[in-house]
């Protein structure tokens, strides 16, 4: 159940896809990845106010309990709902390999 | 890739399954759920320090970028990796129904 996409905190403040450019050095991959040398990492960042992009029933419960017990129960969290694949050309013991990662770049976000 | 389960912050401080007792009133369900009157909600709570229970490559990247840019990139977040089903007996227009919810109770946690 994909709940309200209206952000009550103001435009761009709630859970959404952001792009962060990162070098292989930033990621700690410089020694074993050949290409690309930099990645446009898409990730899910932002607040999850009441029922905003609630992923499922669990997220709805979490919102209710966070309201009641904010010190015990955290608010839902902005995480990937799906991913885009990415190919890395990487060094191996025997040479090089092409590895497709299906869980590297966020495609869509929700709150859970 | 389920990374290290050792919590560097001390026992019980990192991402793990917690149980929170909640009444139908707490959950806002009193008007439409007949049974149970109380739910033992299992949810994922706790910190996600470097590589602790990293769900996938995305979580590993997030950790690296959070270290570099803590104001821009949040740390990974503790969320359900899987769920346990739960049956609710609920009121309907015509009487009652048994509804199984597959996404209500967290079964296992990871960081993403």
């Amino acid at each position: 159940a994909r709940n309200g996409d209206h952000c009550p905190l103001g435009p761009g403040r709630c859970c959404r896809l952001h792009t962060v450019r990162a070098s292989l050095e930033d990621l700690g991959w410089a020694d074993w990845v050949l290409s690309p040398r930099e990645v446009q990492v898409t990730m899910c960042i932002g607040a999850c106010p009441s029922q905003f992009r609630a992923a499922n029933m669990h997220a709805q419960i979490k919102t209710s309990l966070h309201r009641l017990k904010p010190d015990t129960v955290p608010a839902p969290c902005c995480v990937p709902a799906s991913y885009n694949p990415m190919v890395l050309i990487q060094k191996t013991d025997t040479g090089v390999s092409l590895q497709t990662y299906d869980d590297l770049l966020a495609k869509d976000c929700h709150c859970i | 890739a389920r990374n290290g389960d050792h919590c560097p912050l001390g026992p019980g401080r990192c991402c793990r399954l917690h149980t929170v007792r909640a009444s139908l009133e707490d959950l806002g369900w009193a008007d439409w759920v007949l049974s149970p009157r109380e739910v033992q909600v299992t949810m994922c709570i706790g910190a996600c320090p470097s590589q602790f229970r990293a769900a996938n490559m995305h979580a590993q990247i997030k950790t690296s970028l959070h270290r570099l840019k803590p104001d821009t990139v949040p740390a990974p977040c503790c969320v359900p990796a899987s769920y346990n089903p739960m049956v609710l007996i609920q009121k309907t227009d015509t009487g009652v129904s048994l509804q199984t919810y597959d996404d209500l109770l967290a079964k296992d946690c990871h960081c993403i």
């Epitope: 070098s23 040398r37 930099e38 885009n84 694949p85 190919v87 050309i89 | -």
Partner: antibody, heavy 119, light 107 residues
């Protein structure tokens, strides 16, 4: 200003080997991969392979494995491609080309080196 | 290997016209595609990366679009400097193959 300056045209005999150089300037040499591309008479372009000057890793188009060897000299910021056991099929213009850091294009190209294999 | 099928192979058009060149990949390449222009006797020049991103200094009359297996390069209001050959190239798994090229000639 980014520049890739390739060595001059070559006329070589069948069976011989030769090395083309590509001198890079105007950017951090180890920060970008260097690719090599073959353009045969007419128009078709073929990707030969790439070298990562930072970690020395190479990847080749299977078609050119054993035909081309890619190396770099970091101190002189120069990339090299050695072509082995040349035949008339290897007559072409060869380009070095810098790969963008995101790995989805080649943004600067050398002027090309014409290789003619003939007895 | 992924095959890149480019069409048309050649095109004869007048200055001021609009043209669209297409490239079809034999499998999904997730927008990992570049377009190049090459003039006779010169090196290729980058026009577009990542299917839609115009390279620095490329005039806005050029635009790239597409996703999945289908991509296109559009040139509106053709100018005389735009004549030459155009190539697409994918960057999804190696080898990074090129399309067969499209030769754009003045009518």
């Amino acid at each position: 200003e980014v520049q890739l300056q390739q060595s001059g045209p070559e006329l070589v005999k069948p069976g011989a080997s030769m090395k083309i150089s590509c001198k890079a300037s105007g950017y951090s040499f180890t920060g970008y991969n260097m690719n090599w591309v073959k353009q045969s008479q007419g128009k078709n372009l073929e990707w030969i392979g790439l070298i990562n000057p930072y970690n020395g890793g190479t990847i080749y188009n299977q078609k050119f494995k054993g035909k081309a060897t890619l190396t770099v000299d970091k101190s002189s910021t120069t990339a090299y491609m050695e072509l082995l056991s040349l035949t008339s099929e290897d007559s072409a213009v060869y380009y070095c080309a810098r790969e963008v850091r995101l790995g989805n294009a080649m943004d600067y190209w050398g002027q090309g080196t014409s290789v003619t294999v003939s007895s | 290997d992924i095959q890149m099928t480019q069409s048309p192979a050649s095109l004869s058009v007048s200055v001021g016209e609009t043209v669209t060149i297409t490239c079809r990949a034999s499998e999904n390449i997730y927008s990992n595609l570049a377009w190049y222009q090459q003039k006779q006797g010169k090196s290729p020049q980058l026009l577009v990366s990542a299917a839609t991103n115009l390279a620095d200094g490329v005039p806005s009359r050029f635009s790239g679009s597409g996703s999945g297996t289908q991509y296109s390069l559009k040139i509106i209001s053709l100018q005389s400097v735009d004549f030459g050959s155009y190539y697409c190239q994918h960057f999804w798994g190696t080898p990074w193959t090129f399309g067969g090229g499209t030769k754009l000639e003045i009518k």
